[in-house]
Interface confidence: low
C-alpha cells in the first residue's frame, strides 16, 4: 500500500535568465528511494540513482545541475522553458510516486512566487 | 517477476570485440534505466555502461570509446558492443535495472580477454 506524499515547490516563477530550484520531498512512507527522474512534459532532465548518483541528460547538461539533495537547479532560464516538471521517485517497496511543479519564466522583474528557492 | 538474462560471453584475444545481451522480462522495459557492471576476480563490482530511455547512454571512463550500450525497446533486449578489448576487461559481466526495486541482477556473463 502506498502511504508516502510528494511535497513540491508548487507552482512558481522566476525571471529570463536567472536560476531556480526545483525540489521535491517524499514523506510518510519508510519506502527506499532507489532512483529520482527529473522530467519537463515527456523529455528527461536528470536522474538521482542510489547505486550511479547523478546523471544529467545531455541535451540540458549546460542548463541544469544537480541538488540541492535530490532537487534540480535550472539555469539561464529561458521563456521556452515555462511548463510542467515532474519528480518521479521510484521506491521499494511501495512503487513509484510523481510530484508536479509548473514552472513560469518571465520577462521582467515581476517574478513573486517561489522565491525562497531562487538563486540570487 | 523480473528477470535478466545475459549471453554473450567468452574468451576473446585482446584487440577484439564482443557482443553482451541481457533479456529482459516482467516489467516496462522502455520506461526503465538499465546498465551493465562487471567483477572481476578479486575486485568490487563497478558500473561500465548506462542507458535510460530516450537513448541516453552513459560510459565508465575506462570503457569510453571502446564500449557501446544500447537498447532494443521492441526486444526487451540491452546490448553491450565492446570493442577493442583488453586483458583489464576480463570479468563477469552483469546486466542490471532499476524499476523500483533496490536492484535486480542477472546471473552475469563471464569475459575472458587473453592470448
Known amino acids: 500500500m502506498m502511504t508516502g506524499t510528494i511535497e513540491t515547490t508548487g507552482n512558481i516563477s522566476a525571471e529570463k535568465g536567472g536560476s531556480i530550484i526545483l525540489q521535491c520531498h517524499l514523506s510518510s512512507t519508510t519506502a527506499q528511494v532507489t532512483q529520482v527522474n527529473w522530467e519537463q512534459q515527456d523529455q528527461l532532465l536528470a536522474i538521482c540513482n542510489a547505486d550511479l548518483g547523478w546523471h544529467i541528460s545531455p541535451s540540458f547538461k549546460d542548463r541544469v545541475a544537480p541538488g540541492p539533495g535530490l532537487g534540480l537547479t535550472l539555469q539561464s532560464l529561458t521563456v521556452n522553458d515555462t511548463g510542467e516538471y515532474f519528480c518521479i521517485y521510484h521506491t521499494y517497496p511501495d512503487g513509484t510516486y510523481t510530484g508536479r511543479i509548473f514552472l513560469e519564466v518571465l520577462e521582467s522583474s515581476v517574478a513573486e512566487h517561489g522565491a525562497r528557492f531562487q538563486i540570487p | 517477476e523480473v528477470q535478466l538474462v545475459e549471453s554473450g560471453g567468452g574468451l576473446v584475444q585482446p584487440g577484439g570485440s564482443l557482443r553482451l545481451s541481457c533479456a529482459a522480462s516482467?516489467?516496462?522495459?522502455?520506461?526503465?534505466?538499465m546498465g551493465w557492471f562487471r567483477q572481476a576476480p578479486g575486485k568490487e563490482r563497478e558500473w561500465v555502461a548506462s542507458v535510460l530511455r530516450g537513448g541516453y547512454t552513459w560510459y565508465a571512463d575506462s570503457v569510453k570509446g571502446r564500449f557501446t550500450i544500447s537498447a532494443d525497446n521492441s526486444k526487451n533486449t540491452a546490448y553491450l558492443q565492446m570493442n577493442s578489448l583488453k586483458p583489464e576487461d576480463t570479468a563477469v559481466y552483469y546486466c542490471?535495472?532499476?524499476?523500483?526495486?533496490?536492484?535486480?541482477w542477472g546471473q552475469g556473463t563471464l569475459v575472458t580477454v587473453s592470448s
Open positions: 542490471v535495472t532499476d524499476v523500483g526495486a533496490p536492484d535486480y
Open positions: 516482467g516489467f516496462t522495459f522502455d520506461r526503465s534505466w
